[in-house]
């Protein structure tokens, strides 16, 4: 009954890449997914978590240089810490210097994903889209 | 000699995506790549088939969702051909109709993808990015 | 460069209706929101229509509600503002605008000249 | 729908600093945007969010924001700086909806 249940042989000269949830983007072994409804902070971090996700971390301008590519703008996991005055990710790492042009759009504790690394901060009660990611092992 | 010598167990609860040449974007068993360097039509078409791949095509809207969230404008696979007035992909398919909103930016027989699905026609001599595509089997 | 150029503005009788337009070049229009502007001669800027890159959302100033409806062509990079049920209080001077995000406007047209009178 | 108030009209000595003020209750929870109009010309976007300025705007344009109440600073006026500024919120009653200040008319002496 084991769920690992495909054997795949992949080329040397190509790779297969994830797994990631079934019809997410899949770029250098990490997966993720654009949610064009519209929901706050807490509700698009909800939504990634049910998915067993997580907002969009920024960790590597080399590795995930996709995101320069997207238009508009998307919740991503960045939160402001009042207390510190640092900006921090779900998983409580601080964000990295030179990674995220930080622009403050509006007072609030959340950043939104713009891209070529851009973040805006804005109200964590706004409605956005937003943007999941899962990084795989 | 095998160019084949990875054994991969997947779960059943997600899936790998590919295979892809390395480090490109696999979205629905597509393979994508985003090229920066400015090219004319020819040059990204020939840079696009010394990787295996073909300018970018584009097939459908479900299948392709990723495309609407593209920003900017690249080269794809898309000509026109003046005798019969159509727009044909490299592989000699008409581009289907509702597909992609055809925008004469300019006198020209290549066309540019931009986002939301649109094509913006360009003269085929002026560089810009393209997007290289690869379909699995 | 970007551009914004309105028309479709003149004089109408009230109750009347007329259609804006507003042709965008030198960007990609459909990524960005779309809002329409409007000041009555010697007055202020009075918010009046905003809608979404896609054209899935639009918005209104409570005092045109109903009677304005605001949509795009993505195809045609034009924006446009039907206006029914116009009203004396109408006239003013329209822009469109760009927004560089949200309620920031970045780019506007040079307006045009919408006259409600008998 | 929420109010900013401005006020109508505000003067300054050419080289001087001066200081255009924007009042309301969305203010609290949002930053304001201000907007430059000379006589006869569209609006420019000067000042958005906390203290972001487009490109082209001299630097000598600032923007500040304390409890209900935004600022915008022109630091050593030119003459050319004369014209009407409209400070814009979002609307605290609905957040897509926005509203303008009536404008300040600034002279530089």
């Known amino acids: 009954n084991s769920l690992f249940n495909q054997e795949v042989q992949i080329p040397l000269t190509e790779s297969y890449c994830g797994p990631c949830p079934k019809n997410w983007i899949c770029y250098k072994n990490n997966c993720y997914q654009f949610f064009n409804e519209s929901k706050n902070w807490y509700e698009s971090q909800a939504s990634c978590m049910s998915q067993n996700a997580s907002l969009l971390k920024v960790y590597s301008k080399e590795d995930q240089d996709l995101l320069k590519l997207v238009k508009s703008y998307h919740w991503m996991g960045l939160v402001h810490i009042p207390t510190n005055g640092s900006w921090q990710w779900e998983d409580g790492s601080i964000l990295s210097p030179n990674l995220l042009t930080i622009i403050e759009m509006q007072k609030g504790d959340c950043a939104l994903y713009a891209s070529s690394f851009k973040g805006y901060i804005e109200n964590c009660s706004i409605p956005n889209t937003y943007i999941c990611m899962q990084r795989t092992v | 000699n095998s160019l084949f010598n990875q054994e991969v167990q997947i779960p059943l609860t997600e899936s790998y995506c590919g295979p892809c040449p390395k480090n490109w974007i696999c979205y629905k068993n597509n393979c994508y790549q985003f090229f920066n360097e400015s090219k004319n039509w020819y040059e990204s078409q020939a840079s696009c088939m010394s990787q295996n791949a073909s300018l970018l095509k584009v097939y459908s809207k479900e299948d392709q969702d990723l495309l609407k969230l593209v920003k900017s404008y690249h080269w794809m696979g898309l000509v026109h051909i003046p005798t019969n007035g159509s727009w044909q992909w490299e592989d000699g398919s008409i581009l289907s109709p509702n597909l992609l909103t055809i925008i004469e930016m300019q006198k020209g027989d290549c066309a540019l993808y931009a986002s939301s699905f649109k094509g913006y026609i360009e003269n085929c001599s002026i560089p810009n990015t393209y997007i290289c595509m690869q379909r699995t089997v | 460069e970007v551009q914004l150029l309105e028309s479709g503005g003149g004089l109408v009788q009230p109750g009347g209706s007329l259609r804006l337009s507003c042709a965008a070049s030198?960007?990609?229009?459909?990524?960005?929101?779309m809002s329409w502007v409007r000041q009555a001669p010697g007055k202020g800027l009075e918010w009046v229509s905003a809608?979404?890159?896609?054209?899935?959302?639009?918005y209104y100033a409570d005092s045109v509600k109903g009677r304005f409806t605001i949509s795009r062509d993505n195809s045609k990079n034009t924006l446009y503002l039907q206006m029914n049920s116009l009203r004396a209080e109408d006239t003013a001077v329209y822009y469109c605008?760009?927004?560089?995000?949200?309620?920031?406007?970045?780019?506007w047209g040079q307006g045009t000249l919408v006259t409600v009178s008998s | 729908s929420s109010e900013l108030t401005q006020d109508p009209a505000v003067s300054v000595a050419l080289g001087q600093t001066v200081r255009i003020t924007c009042q309301g209750d969305s203010l609290r929870s949002y930053y304001a945007s201000w907007y430059q109009q000379k006589p006869g010309q569209a609006p420019v976007l000067v000042i958005y969010?906390?203290?972001n300025r487009p490109s082209g705007i001299p630097d000598r344009f600032s923007g500040s924001s304390s409890g209900n109440t935004a600022s915008l600073t022109i630091t050593g006026a030119q003459a050319e700086d004369e014209a009407d500024y409209y400070c814009n919120s979002r609307d605290s009653f609905s957040i897509h909806q926005n509203v303008f200040g009536g404008g300040t008319k600034l002279t530089v002496l």
């Open positions: 605008a760009k927004e560089l995000y949200r309620e920031y406007m970045d780019y």
């Open positions: 030198g960007f990609t229009f459909s990524s960005y929101a």
């Open positions: 809608i979404s890159g896609s054209g899935g959302s639009t």
């Open positions: 969010g906390k203290n």
